[in-house]
């Protein structure tokens, strides 16, 4: 499979484990790969009793769930752990958990960077 | 296409060392974090070590800290993988595998080699 | 650490037969979750990342679905060239990966 049209080649970097899997903790991820192979960004995190827990997030590997995604929506309707991916730049900030079965959109908002 | 080749297993004392090489070559070596899964006869798959892509982060199993090193060399396209105070339960097939980007699959693996640890 | 189980650790099946094994972690892996298959004196082979994506060039009668912590590989109609041991993987908690017991496919 080809690059797709909006062809991904950063995505926003969030590790939580990051101490100990001695990572960054955040930032952006340059995705690098082969010409055959498309590549999405994802996000993962844990909605406990209505607090958002980030987990991950960083590129994804070629993968037809993320084709043409533009923006990264959760759909499984109540994982241990949530997980989206989409296509182009950056398109991993904001997530949004939209079960398939029907139910509220929510949308995650990333908090404002404070000023350096 | 995308080739991975071991070398420098062989039949070592306890107490031993030896130092297992993987030349990597059709794809960019410098791009990807790499890693070491061993096999021991008849038994399953156990992660080793694994170095990213820089060589800057280097991660060990409980099994080999503080006796195996993993280096690579992104001019020579080759990772190392230095085994010191080598124990008869180290005894195994070496595989070097390149990981990708996430969820970080072992997408191409060499065909490896053995290292027995007998006295 | 993360422990994966798979079962069956052995199964002997026929041609044309229909294959599942199944993995399970000891805590939500998300879809970081890999298959490979092995035969005798050979190194393994990627066949599905991330819980469910085909590997360039893997036959589309192996499938893997699940996430969290349960996941299957089926195999939809078994073949010669399949009987091997596969093993699945968490790559969650990187790189400190963990593999499965692996289960072997024999010819019944």
């Known amino acids: 499979s080809g690059r797709g049209e909006a062809e991904t080649r950063e995505c926003i970097y969030y590790n939580a484990n990051w101490e100990l899997e001695r990572t960054n903790q955040s930032g952006l991820e340059r995705c690098e790969g082969e010409q055959d192979k498309r590549l999405h960004c994802y996000a993962s995190w844990r909605n406990s009793s209505g607090t958002i827990e980030l987990v991950k997030k960083g590129c994804w590997l070629d993968d037809f769930n993320c084709y043409d995604r533009q923006e990264c929506v959760a759909t499984e309707e109540n994982p241990q752990v949530y997980f989206c991916c989409c296509e182009g730049n950056f398109c991993n900030e904001r997530f949004t958990h939209l079960p398939e079965a029907g139910g509220p959109e929510v949308t995650y908002e990333p908090p404002p960077t404070a000023p350096t | 296409e995308v080739q991975l080749l071991e070398s420098g297993g062989g039949l070592v004392q306890p107490g031993g060392s030896l130092r297992l090489s993987c030349a990597a070559s059709?794809?960019?070596?410098?791009?990807?974090?790499m890693t070491w899964v061993r096999q021991a006869p008849g038994k399953g798959l156990e992660w080793v070590s694994a170095?990213?892509?820089?060589?800057?982060?280097?991660y060990y199993a409980d099994s080999v800290k503080g006796r195996f090193t993993i280096s690579r060399d992104n001019s020579k396209n080759t990772l190392y993988l230095q085994m010191n105070s080598l124990r008869a339960e180290d005894t195994a097939v070496y595989y070097c595998a390149r990981e990708n980007v996430a969820p970080r699959p072992l997408d191409y693996w060499g065909q490896g080699t053995l290292v027995t640890v007998s006295s | 650490d993360i422990q994966m189980t798979q079962s069956p650790s052995s199964l002997s099946a026929s041609v044309g037969d229909r294959v599942t094994i199944t993995c399970r972690a000891s805590q939500s892996v998300s879809r970081f979750l890999n298959w490979y298959q092995q035969k005798p004196g050979k190194a393994p082979k990627l066949l599905i990342y991330g819980a469910s994506i085909l590997q360039t060039g893997v036959p589309s009668r192996f499938s893997g679905s699940g996430s969290g912590t349960d996941f299957t590989l089926t195999i939809s109609s078994l073949q010669p060239e399949d009987f091997a041991t596969y093993y699945c993987q968490q790559s969650y908690t990187t790189p400190t990966w963990t593999f499965g017991g692996g289960t072997k496919v024999e010819i019944k």
């Open positions: 059709g794809f960019r070596f410098g791009n990807y974090a």
């Open positions: 170095i990213g892509a820089s060589g800057g982060s280097t």
